[in-house]
Interface confidence: low
């Protein structure tokens, strides 16, 4: 090496093992700020998401036996909480210039856990929306007991599908030794098979984004059109938040799969990747923030009060295992999403 004391930062192109795909326009930086930007972002998500989701999970857990719909928020909060808790673990390789310190098992397991929780969160949100739609617009025979069973099944199905979506990541991950600079990396290796990569990307896009987005948006729209005359800001915020956080992530996946090597599009996508992944992760701390923001009037009383308000807003105020379902119109007037 000519520069024997080359300082290597994550995304620094001072190593020949990362020749300048990001320099197509000549704008190569010795230290790319976009590579280290995820660290403060991860810290913020962790600091907001852990207490926020813990609070929602605690409140939802307390009332889940009385309120069927609280089960949704309990699962959502648990998924988001696990995602937030795993962030410090995944921040270490970024801070260490891409070096993976957790071994081969960790390489398969840790990124898979975070993917599992992210997809579970997305799918649960979609299932919750569908449940609210069915509750409001569905047949009168759909009793609370039947719904309680259905919600449990749907939660299980969401986690199962999330697990299936995560399997390819675990299968195709492996440790990879780079020597210039020396670092052990946890990589996704499709073995040069573009068809496998395309299939994984397409399935993730359909089941992890497009499907849930259609479910969330259409259910929200149906509730707005059929059941409500007034604006429902929390529901709108949840839909918009979902789209804003996840659309760039899945768009990036499509770009990385189809973009021509050496294209300016691929170069920009690769540079933006850490922030886009961070934005997707930020979705895991979004729901508690929305609940607290839209329940800020109740915050004067207490934090749990705001969470209780959010629970009522998101599933029907008086619904419980004991009570008969009120008319759809009455119930939906108490609902969000």
């Amino acid at each position: 090496m000519g520069n024997d004391s080359v300082s290597y930062e994550y995304g620094d192109y001072s190593d020949l093992s990362d020749r300048p795909v990001d320099c197509l326009d000549g704008a190569c930086l010795a230290i790319d700020p976009l590579r280290v930007a995820p660290l403060p972002l991860y810290a913020a998500i962790f600091l907001v998401g852990v207490p926020g989701n813990a609070m929602v999970a605690w409140v939802a857990g307390k009332v889940a036996r009385r309120r069927v719909g609280a089960t949704w928020l309990l699962h959502l909060a648990v998924a988001d909480l696990l995602c937030c808790l795993s962030l410090p673990i995944l921040a270490v390789p970024i801070a260490r210039g891409g070096h993976w310190p957790y071994g081969a098992v960790g390489c398969r397991a840790l990124p898979s856990i975070i993917l599992l929780t992210m997809y579970a969160s997305v799918l649960l949100l979609a299932a919750l929306s569908a449940d609210l739609c069915f509750l409001a617009l569905g047949p009168a025979w759909w009793s609370t007991v039947q719904r309680a069973c259905g919600v449990q099944v749907a939660c299980g199905a969401a986690w199962t599908l999330a697990l299936l979506l995560t399997v390819p990541s675990a299968i195709y991950r492996r440790l990879h030794q780079e020597h210039f600079p020396a670092r052990l990396q946890c990589v996704v290796d499709y073995g040069g098979s573009s068809s496998t990569e395309n299939a994984v990307t397409a399935i993730r896009f359909l089941f992890g984004f497009l499907g849930p987005l259609v479910a969330v948006a259409s259910c929200h729209s149906a509730l707005l059109c059929w059941a409500a005359r007034r604006c429902r800001p929390l529901g709108t915020a949840i839909v918009v938040g979902f789209f804003v956080c996840w659309a760039p992530y899945h768009l990036l996946g499509l770009v990385l799969t189809v973009a021509a090597p050496n294209s300016a599009l691929l170069a920009r996508a690769l540079r933006a990747e850490p922030l886009i992944v961070g934005l997707a992760l930020a979705h895991s701390c979004l729901n508690p923030m929305l609940f607290l923001y839209f329940g800020r009037a109740q915050l004067r009383r207490s934090l749990p009060a705001a969470c209780h308000w959010a629970l009522r807003e998101s599933q029907g105020q008086d619904e419980s295992v004991d009570s008969k379902k009120s008319t759809s119109h009455d119930l939906v007037s108490e609902m969000e999403v």
Epitope: S14, L16, A30, G98, V187, D189, G192
Partner: antibody
Framework: EVKLEESGGGLVQPGGSMKLSCAAS????????MDWVRQSPEKGLEWVAE??????????YYAESVKGRFTISRDDSKSSVYLQMNSLRAEDTGIYYC??????????WGQGTTVTVSS | DIVMSQSPSSLAVSAGEKVTMSCKSS????????????LAWYQQKPGQSPKLLIY???TRESGVPDRFTGSGSGTDFTLTISSVQAEDLALYFC????????FGAGTKLEIK
């Protein structure tokens, strides 16, 4: 059209010095990473040195076999890259190609200049 | 350094035949960040400088005839010429740019 033209080759005695030049045109030279690659019947193609652009502080890299003896430099105002070769050995004999580096490949090559180290 | 081994060292085929040549690296050339293999194939005709054919193991350089195909990942790579033409008489090199930059010794293609 990208064009790379090497010059400065010739016959030199072992231990002697020689400076190769490469004049570039047809692309934004100041943005480019430039490399020297040599070819000999004994060793085949062998990467020699690389100099990066201003954004990368004109960082230089060398093959182990030439480290401490060869120096790569550039003059962006003249769109030229140079290879100063000192303490030349018989094994340095070969055709020296100027190439535009980066992008994971050497997409553009000059026609080469022959360096012969012999007594 | 990563060692690149090419085989066979030479082969002679008739025009129109299919040709396959191999390149093996002493360690994986797959980049984690771009998920691409840092391997290129070059063609060097007699008396000329090398010309880029394939980069990132399988991406054909613009202007290269589609009879040239690169494949493989990790440590094993292949260059295939589906129907050899007389003008394909040349030396073919593989090159890795994953760790420093090293070339294979080349495969000499001769036309019968």
């Amino acid at each position: 059209e990208v064009k790379l033209e090497e010059s400065g080759g010739g016959l030199v005695q072992p231990g002697g010095s020689m400076k190769l030049s490469c004049a570039a045109s047809g692309f934004t030279f100041s943005d480019a990473w430039m490399d020297w690659v040599r070819q000999s019947p004994e060793k085949g193609l062998e990467w020699v040195a690389e100099i990066r652009n201003k954004a990368n502080n004109h960082a230089t890299y060398y093959a182990e076999s030439v480290k401490g003896r060869f120096t790569i430099s550039r003059d962006d105002s003249k769109s030229s890259v140079y290879l100063q070769m000192n303490s030349l050995r018989a094994e340095d004999t070969g055709i020296y190609y100027c190439t535009r580096g980066g992008y994971y490949v050497f997409a553009y090559w000059g026609q080469g200049t022959t360096v012969t180290v012999s007594s | 350094d990563i060692v690149m081994s090419q085989s066979p060292s030479s082969l002679a085929v008739s025009a129109g035949e299919k040709v396959t040549m191999s390149c093996k690296s002493s360690q994986s050339l797959l980049s984690s960040r771009t998920r691409k293999n840092y391997l290129a194939w070059y063609q060097q005709k007699p008396g000329q400088s090398p010309k880029l054919l394939i980069y990132w193991a399988s991406t054909r350089e613009s202007g290269v005839p589609d009879r040239f195909t690169g494949s493989g990942s990790g440590t094993d790579f292949t260059l295939t010429i589906s129907s050899v033409q007389a003008e394909d008489l040349a030396l073919y090199f593989c090159n890795q740019s994953y760790d420093l930059l090293t070339f294979g010794a080349g495969t000499k293609l001769e036309i019968k």
